[in-house]
C-alpha cells in the first residue's frame, strides 16, 4: 500500500493511523474507526471515510432534471458497516435496530425497518448528478473551459478517469457535472464514482480529505470557480423502493 | 495577522497623476480579490477599484477611464493608477481585502482593511 | 444605478439589542450579498464586522451578527456596548461596480 515513506503518511487520506510495520518497514496505514489498512495510491472508500469522521471527534436549458428515482442525501452522518473490502454493507442498522438498505454511496433506499428487514444485494449507483451553485463572478464562465476543468480536477484530483465524467452542464450560476459508471463498465482499479463525488464535496465544503495538500484552488482561464452550494443525485441501476407515504 | 499598509498619497495637482500602492502580509496573497476604497472630507464609503485574484477589474463610475488597478503578486503588492485628477478625488484611499478570490466587484465581501492614505487634489 | 437604503441613525441603552437594515443591493441569480462595516471616526480605518451575509471576522465579538431575508440584510448588535458606538456602513454590488450604504449613526446612550 502505497504512503509517503519519508514521514509515513497517507497521501490520499487524512483520516488514518500509519506506521512503518508494513512488510519490510514499509509504510502501512489505517483507516480510523475500523483499522481497514488503505490503499493509499487512491481514494478511500466513502464507506470507511464515513466511519472514520463517526470515529473523530465530532433558454435551452441544459440543466438536467433528476428523474423521480433520483436519491438526495437527507439523512446525513451515519456510522456505516462496511466489508472487508470497504464498500457499504446492503443493510445498515443503528444501535436501536432501526435497519434500512442503502446503495453503493452508502445513501438510504429504502424506508426504515426493524431487525427482519432484508436487503438482498447492494444495489450500485450507476449515474450521479453533482449539481453546484457558484458565487458571484464578473462574468459567465466560458463553458468549455469550465468544462475542461472540471474533467482535469476530477482525472488529475480524484483519479477518476475522464471517461466515467459524462457532461459538463452550465447555466450561470448553476454547474451540473454527471458521472455514470455502471457495474460492467468499472474495472479493478477504477475508482468508484460515489467515491470521487464524495472528496469533491468535501473538498467543495472546505474539508479535504487529502493529507497536507491545500484545499480545493478551482480556477477557469485564472478566474476563481468558488462554490456556495451542492446538491448531490444519485440514480441507482434499481430503482428504490419507498412507501407512497414517503412520496406525499 | 492580516496587514494592508497604503502609500503614494499626498499633494497632487489637479490635471496630474496618481500612484498608490498597498503591499499586504499576513495571508496568501495570490489567492484573494483586492480593491481600493475611498472616502472623501465628511462623506460616506465610495468603491474605486478592485482586482481579482484572477486579474479581471473593476471599477467605480467616478473613476471609470482614468483608473487602472494592477497587482504584482511576487511582491504582494496592487497598485491604483488614478490619471486627470480632480478635486473631487480628494480622499482618504483604503486598501481592501476580499475574503474570497472572486469577482473583484462585491464590496460585500471585504474582510480586511488597510489604515488608509490621504490624497488631496490642489492647486 | 442601485442605491443602498439604511436609516441614518439609530440608538440603543447599553445591553440592548440594535438592529440596522439594509436594502436595494444587485441580485445575483436570487441572492443579495451584504456586507458590515464600523467606522469609529471620520478618516479612521473601518472595520469589517460582518461580511458575505452572515460572516464575521475571527477579531469580532459574537454580539454581532448578520442575516438575510430576500433582498434585505440586517445586522444584529446583541448586548450593545458603548464602545459600539459608530457609523455603520453596509456594502454590495450593482452589476460591475460595488456600493455603499450612506451609513448609520449607532448612538449608544
Known amino acids: 500500500h502505497t504512503a509517503a515513506q519519508d514521514n509515513c503518511t497517507c497521501p490520499t487520506n487524512k483520516m488514518t493511523v500509519c506506521s512503518p510495520d508494513g512488510p519490510g518497514g514499509r509504510c502501512q496505514c489505517r483507516a480510523l474507526g475500523s483499522g481497514v489498512a488503505v490503499d493509499c495510491s487512491t481514494l478511500t472508500s466513502k464507506c470507511l471515510l464515513l466511519k472514520a469522521r463517526m470515529s473523530a471527534p465530532k433558454n435551452a436549458r441544459t440543466l438536467v432534471r433528476p428523474n423521480e428515482h433520483a436519491l438526495v442525501d437527507n439523512d446525513g452522518l451515519y456510522d456505516p458497516d462496511c466489508d472487508p473490502e470497504g464498500r457499504f454493507k446492503a443493510r445498515q442498522c443503528n444501535q436501536t435496530s432501526v435497519c434500512w438498505c442503502v446503495n453503493s454511496v452508502g445513501v438510504r433506499r429504502t424506508d426504515k425497518g426493524d431487525l427482519s428487514l432484508r436487503c438482498d444485494e447492494l444495489v450500485r449507483t450507476h449515474h450521479i448528478l453533482i449539481d453546484l451553485r457558484h458565487r458571484p463572478t464578473a462574468g459567465a464562465f466560458n463553458h468549455s473551459d469550465l468544462d475542461a476543468e472540471l474533467r482535469r480536477l476530477f482525472r488529475e484530483r480524484y483519479r477518476l478517469h475522464p471517461k466515467f465524467v459524462a457532461a459538463v452542464h452550465y447555466e450561470q450560476p448553476t454547474i451540473q457535472i454527471e458521472l455514470r459508471q455502471n457495474t460492467s463498465q468499472k474495472a479493478a482499479g477504477d475508482v468508484d464514482i460515489g467515491d470521487a463525488a464524495y472528496y469533491f464535496e468535501r473538498d467543495v465544503k472546505g474539508e479535504s480529505l487529502f493529507q497536507g495538500r491545500g484545499g480545493l484552488d478551482l480556477r477557469v482561464r485564472g478566474e476563481p470557480l468558488q462554490v456556495e452550494r451542492t446538491l448531490i443525485y444519485y440514480l441507482d441501476e434499481i430503482p428504490p423502493k419507498f412507501s407512497m407515504k414517503r412520496l406525499t | 495577522a492580516v496587514t494592508l499598509d497604503e502609500s503614494g498619497g499626498g499633494l497632487q495637482t489637479p490635471g496630474g497623476a496618481l500612484s498608490l500602492v498597498c503591499k499586504g502580509s499576513?495571508?496568501?496573497?495570490?489567492?484573494?480579490?483586492m480593491g481600493w476604497v475611498r472616502q472623501a472630507p465628511g462623506k460616506g464609503l465610495e468603491y474605486v477599484a478592485a482586482?481579482?485574484?484572477?486579474?479581471?477589474?473593476g471599477y467605480g463610475a467616478a473613476v471609470k477611464g482614468r483608473a487602472t488597478i494592477s497587482k504584482d503578486t511576487g511582491q504582494s503588492t496592487v497598485r491604483l493608477q488614478l490619471n486627470n485628477l480632480r478635486a473631487e478625488d480628494t480622499a482618504t484611499y483604503y486598501c481592501a481585502k476580499s475574503g474570497y478570490g472572486g469577482s473583484a466587484s462585491y464590496v460585500s465581501d471585504i474582510d480586511a482593511w488597510g489604515h488608509g492614505t490621504e490624497v488631496i487634489v490642489s492647486s | 444605478a442601485l442605491a443602498l437604503t439604511q436609516p441614518s441613525s439609530v440608538s440603543a441603552n447599553p445591553g440592548e439589542t440594535v438592529e440596522i437594515t439594509c436594502s436595494g443591493g444587485g441580485d445575483y441569480y436570487g441572492t443579495y450579498y451584504y456586507g458590515w462595516y464600523q467606522q469609529k471616526a471620520p478618516g479612521s480605518a473601518p472595520v469589517t464586522v460582518i461580511y458575505d451575509n452572515t460572516k464575521r471576522p475571527s477579531n469580532i465579538p459574537s454580539r454581532f451578527s448578520g442575516s438575510t431575508s430576500g433582498s434585505t440584510n440586517t445586522l444584529t448588535i446583541t448586548g450593545v456596548q458603548a464602545d459600539d458606538e459608530a457609523v455603520y456602513y453596509c456594502?454590495?454590488?450593482?452589476?460591475?461596480?460595488?456600493?455603499f450604504g450612506a451609513g448609520t449613526t449607532l448612538t449608544v446612550l
Open positions: 482586482i481579482s485574484s484572477g486579474s479581471s477589474t
Open positions: 499576513g495571508f496568501t496573497f495570490s489567492s484573494y480579490a
Open positions: 456594502g454590495s454590488y450593482d452589476s460591475s461596480a460595488g456600493i
